[in-house]
Interface confidence: medium
């Protein structure tokens, strides 16, 4: 709390300008009118205030707007945003994407802070869903943003927004998140032709079910091993050797290097050794010839 002291003669601020950088903290408190500050917030960012001085300016705004700042002030906060706490931000109603961009720009190059996370949460909740423009903006500033959302939060992403997602935006997503995003991506890209469709859907395939992988195997897609290794194990297990061979195309040779890792290891255990031998890769661990394979899940379904 800054002590209340009278403003020295001749020091009363008539406008927010560079002369204020030479004011001590108590002089800023005494000589800068909060209403003047609020109307000239756009100037603050261009003036090289120290963070100590910005603390004083924030204090003045807090006194003027105890219920939370209006958007006209928020959009011009600039570096003053770094002084806001999540509690401050929860009082705001941010509706403009331009305001969001302006504040994210201030934090650019730094990790997502609790302030930024709160700001984004307030903005998205205010909009009701993660529309394409918002997602575009957020992933531009924070490529990992999408993967920081819970599956429940991701369910509010409309399929049209999926067009804004780049492969690197999904790098840190786990299978539960991809389970939610994949059907949306499938819907978003459904009108594309085979090869174009595969390029777009590839990053989302960690959420694809078996039947979709079977369908892709009929389209000469030549899936690379890195993508194959990210597929759901339960979706890969029912694929036949022939289907995996078609799915991977020339990349099938890479299975040998991955034979001890999931999902390849588990898939090998489900295949007949005879069938694996047809690949000519020396994959071992399949079901020996002459053994009967009982699909117990099918048996349970029938009984």
């Amino acid at each position: 709390e800054v002590e209340k002291t009278a403003c020295p003669s001749g020091k009363k601020a008539r406008e927010i300008d560079e002369s204020l950088i030479f004011y001590k903290k108590w002089e800023l408190e005494a000589c800068v009118d909060a209403a003047l500050l609020a109307t000239q917030m756009d100037r603050v960012n261009a003036i090289p205030f120290t963070y100590e001085q910005l603390d004083v300016l924030k204090h003045k705004l807090d006194e003027l707007y105890p219920q939370g700042y209006p958007e006209s002030v928020i959009q011009h906060l600039g570096y003053l945003f770094l002084k806001m706490s999540p509690e401050d931000i929860r009082k705001w109603n941010v509706t403009s994407l331009e305001t969001l961009k302006a504040l994210l720009e201030v934090n650019k190059g730094h990790e997502m802070s609790p302030q930024v996370a709160t700001l984004i949460d307030r903005f998205v909740k205010g909009r009701g869903q993660l529309d394409k423009d918002t997602l575009d903006t957020l992933t531009a500033f924070y490529p990992g943003y999408l993967c920081s959302l819970s599956p429940e939060e991701l369910s509010s992403v409309p399929p049209s927004s999926i067009w804004a997602v780049r492969p690197q935006d999904l790098d840190t997503c786990d299978p539960r998140q991809l389970d939610v995003l994949y059907p949306k991506a499938r819907l978003a890209f459904q009108n594309m032709n085979g090869s174009e469709y595969f390029v777009k859907i590839q990053s989302f395939l960690g959420g694809a079910p078996t039947e979709d992988l079977k369908a892709l195997s009929q389209q000469n897609v030549s899936m690379d091993l890195a993508t194959f290794m990210k597929l759901r194990t339960d979706a890969v297990l029912p694929l036949t050797v022939a289907e995996v061979q078609k799915l991977l195309g020339p990349h099938v040779e890479g299975l040998k290097a991955e034979e001890r890792h999931r999902p390849v290891r588990d898939w090998i255990l489900r295949q007949r050794q005879d069938d694996l031998d047809t690949l000519g890769l020396g994959l071992q661990g399949g079901i020996p010839n002459g053994y009967l394979v009982l699909d117990l899940s099918m048996q349970e379904a029938l009984s």
Partner: nanobody, 115 residues
Framework: EVQLVESGGGLIQPGGSLRLSCAAS????????MGWVRQAPGKGLEWVST???????YYANFVKGRFTISRDNSKNTLYLQMNSLRAEDTAVYYC?????????WGQGTLVTVSS
């Protein structure tokens, strides 16, 4: 974190010149602007000059025309060229950087103007 180390202070006669340096290290990419603040014996801190990352400069009235602030980004160094020094410029001069998300200070360098 940003570390600041000043140098260049000393004893100088009135009317003389001196150049102070401030070497910055650490997370210098987070620096928004830098400046010089001084504290005369028995007095409070007073701002002297500021330079922004784009090179805009600001001076207190009492040093305008005599002092020049500059920075060499390739060396991560801030300078204060002080000409026409007066007895009242005697003070400890501190380098100060405003960097994400706080203000950093150097340990100060003493300038004594005396005949």
């Amino acid at each position: 974190e940003v570390q600041l180390v000043e140098s260049g202070g000393g004893l100088i006669q009135p009317g003389g010149s001196l150049r102070l340096s401030c070497a910055a290290s650490g997370n210098i990419g987070s620096i928004r602007h830098m400046g010089w603040v001084r504290q005369a014996p028995g007095k409070g801190l007073e701002w002297v000059s500021t330079i922004t990352t784009v090179g805009t400069t600001y001076y207190a009235n009492f040093v305008k025309g005599r002092f020049t602030i500059s920075r060499d980004n390739s060396k991560n160094t801030l300078y204060l060229q002080m000409n026409s020094l007066r007895a009242e410029d005697t003070a400890v001069y501190y380098c100060r950087a405003t960097a994400h998300p706080t203000d950093y200070w150097g340990q100060g360098t003493l300038v004594t103007v005396s005949s």
